[in-house]
Interface confidence: low
């Protein structure tokens, strides 16, 4: 059995792609025939699943280039949290204990987001046992996680969140130190094996993997809304809106935002990615009648998808003894 | 990308079929190929694959010592010779390759070959 | 080598119709399950693959769920097209098997 490959390097040229180089193993131990490049999905952070993106004044946006976090100013009022489905009007509130604790965590918060990718990639991972690599592997990858009881959190199980095991994908690369891997998830976290496999591979298997992580680069316009904006009337001077989420966005939409106005689009509203989860909306609240224009806008991992066309509703004033009642 | 396959034959018990399968559209050394057959208003039989970067095989045991997968880069084809025939191994033959999913699921498939034995 | 199971072998179903098909290995599989779709004289058609993901250009209307030995497809809402005969295979283990396969018929 040859030893492993040396010096794996991997790099994105597309949203879509990762090109890997490695050189030949020190010790082919006889005739070297090809190797084994197999790839696997990362999970994402289980804390970026959970926490309310719509709690904090400051929006973490990842610059690619150089993998720094910039802490984005909100210039505007701070966001508050759109009532989802038939929760009923939404009011400030004075602080409780638990988003006093959760402005405690905020460091922490930061430092998580700040992290993620930067563990991902170079918090030594456990070697997978040697296995015969035409047998697709069965590695688990635990999701990291933390408990917290901060308001700024959510313990609604996202389906995604559950996924944190992705099947290995494979290929095989004959004479030759290089390979581009194709059909990628865009800015999404993979983990690339090489094995050198040499004339007695069939009989013996291939080497230990020699691994390396890769991200792959955003996709220009995956982080847009792909539908229309509908809405629907609801009682108390309220409308739901309704949009289709991102097919395959930038690794992870974190929220959406909404800004609707009746002359201007003046206001915003923020919707967690749970929110929308669980309704596949928002509702707007204490609307005075008349007609509106609303534009939404998804967040992710890697930026902003662009604003919808507009879609135009109206709240229709209430008549007679109803609007004498009230 | 596409995977077509020789057309119908009709063989006697004993005798042998080499069936083949002609890829285009992708690069042929680097994708497994996987036999199927189906038996008359039956079920899928895996009947194993080949590797066309160096011709290496596996097959299913049923089939072992009957079967044999080769492959011609030249023409980016590979063939199933199936030996010894008998009645039962009347069937569509298909051949199928994982490209876009993990090796073992099949995402693209030839159109079949009919293989009929019969004396 | 892996059995694998399919049931029912045939059901009746009107368009707009929730159907589930099951499939059991006889050991533990690890998620390595995908289902086929084959209409008579075509070659089957790759809908799921490992247990849950939804092959390329398969309508969302085709979902899957399982673990351990237990397997399922369902399609939420049945169209005209979706009559034909449906395969599971287990992928964890050579030789790769498949199930006898359910025959999905208009009622």
């Known amino acids: 059995v040859p030893s492993i490959p040396l010096d794996v390097l991997s790099a994105s040229n597309s949203s879509s792609q990762l090109i890997v180089k490695w050189n030949p193993p020190s010790l082919p131990n006889g005739n070297l025939s090809y190797y084994i490049v197999r790839w696997q999905r990362q999970p994402q952070d289980g804390y970026l699943y959970r926490h309310n993106y719509c709690s904090k004044d400051k929006i973490p946006i990842r610059k690619y280039a150089d993998g720094t976090i910039d802490i984005e100013e909100v210039t505007e009022n701070p966001k508050t949290e759109v009532c989802g489905g038939e929760k009923g009007p939404c009011c400030a509130c004075p602080k409780t204990e638990a988003e006093k604790q959760a402005e405690k965590e905020e460091a922490e918060y930061r430092k998580v987001f700040e992290n993620f990718l930067h563990n991902s990639i170079f918090v030594p991972r456990p070697e997978r046992k040697r296995r015969d690599v035409m047998q697709v592997a069965n590695t688990t990858m635990s999701s990291r996680s933390r408990n917290t009881t901060a308001a700024d959190t959510y313990n609604i199980t996202d389906p995604e969140e559950l996924e944190t095991e992705y099947p290995f994908f494979e290929s095989r690369v004959d004479n030759k130190e290089r390979t581009v891997i194709s059909n990628l998830r865009p800015f999404t976290l993979y983990r690339i094996d090489i094995h050198s496999c040499n004339h007695e591979a069939e009989k013996l298997g291939c080497s230990a993997s020699n691994f390396v992580f890769a991200r792959t680069m955003p996709a220009e316009g995956a982080d847009d809304i792909p539908g229309p904006v509908t809405w629907e009337p609801r009682p108390e001077n309220s409308i739901f809106l309704k949009w289709p989420e991102p097919e395959n966005p930038n690794g992870l939409i974190l929220m959406y935002e909404i800004k609707y106005g009746s002359q201007v689009e003046d206001q915003r509203e923020c919707v967690s990615r749970q929110e929308y989860r669980k309704y596949g909306g928002a509702k707007l609240n204490r609307l005075n009648p008349g007609n509106y224009t609303a534009r939404i806008q998804a967040t992710s991992l890697s930026g902003n998808g662009s604003w919808t066309d507009p879609v135009f509703f109206y709240v229709q004033a209430k008549t007679g003894y109803e609007n004498f009642i009230h | 990308v596409q995977l077509v396959q020789s057309g119908a034959e009709v063989k006697k018990p004993g005798a042998s079929v080499k069936v083949s399968c002609k890829a285009s559209?992708?690069?042929?050394?680097?994708?497994?190929i996987h036999w199927v057959r189906q038996a008359p208003g039956q079920g899928l039989e895996w009947m194993g694959w080949?590797?066309?970067?160096?011709?290496?095989?596996k097959y299913a045991q049923k089939f072992q010592g009957r079967v044999t997968m080769t492959r011609d880069t030249s023409t980016s084809t590979v063939y199933m010779e199936l030996s010894s025939l008998r009645s039962e191994d009347t069937a569509v033959y298909f051949c199928?390759?994982?490209?876009?999913?993990?090796?073992?699921?099949?995402?693209?498939w030839g159109q079949g070959t009919l293989v009929t034995v019969s004396s | 080598d892996i059995q694998m199971t399919q049931s029912p072998s045939s059901l009746s179903a009107s368009v707009g119709d929730r159907v589930t098909i099951t499939c059991r290995a006889s050991?533990?599989?690890?998620?390595?399950l995908n289902w086929y779709q084959q209409k008579p004289g075509k070659a089957p058609k790759l809908l799921i693959y490992?247990?849950?993901r939804l092959q390329s250009g398969v309508p969302s209307r085709f979902s899957g769920r399982g673990s351990g030995t237990d397997y399922s497809l369902t399609i939420s809402s049945l169209q005209p097209e979706d009559f034909a005969t449906y395969f599971c295979?287990?992928?964890?283990?050579?030789?790769?098997?498949f199930g006898g396969g359910t025959k999905v018929e208009i009622k």
């Open positions: 295979q287990q992928g964890s283990t050579l030789p790769y098997t």
């Open positions: 050991q533990d599989i690890s998620k390595y």
């Open positions: 490992y247990t849950s």
């Open positions: 199928a390759s994982p490209m876009i999913t993990p090796n073992y699921a099949m995402d693209y």
């Open positions: 080949i590797w066309p970067g160096d011709g290496s095989t």
């Open positions: 559209g992708y690069t042929f050394t680097s994708y497994y």
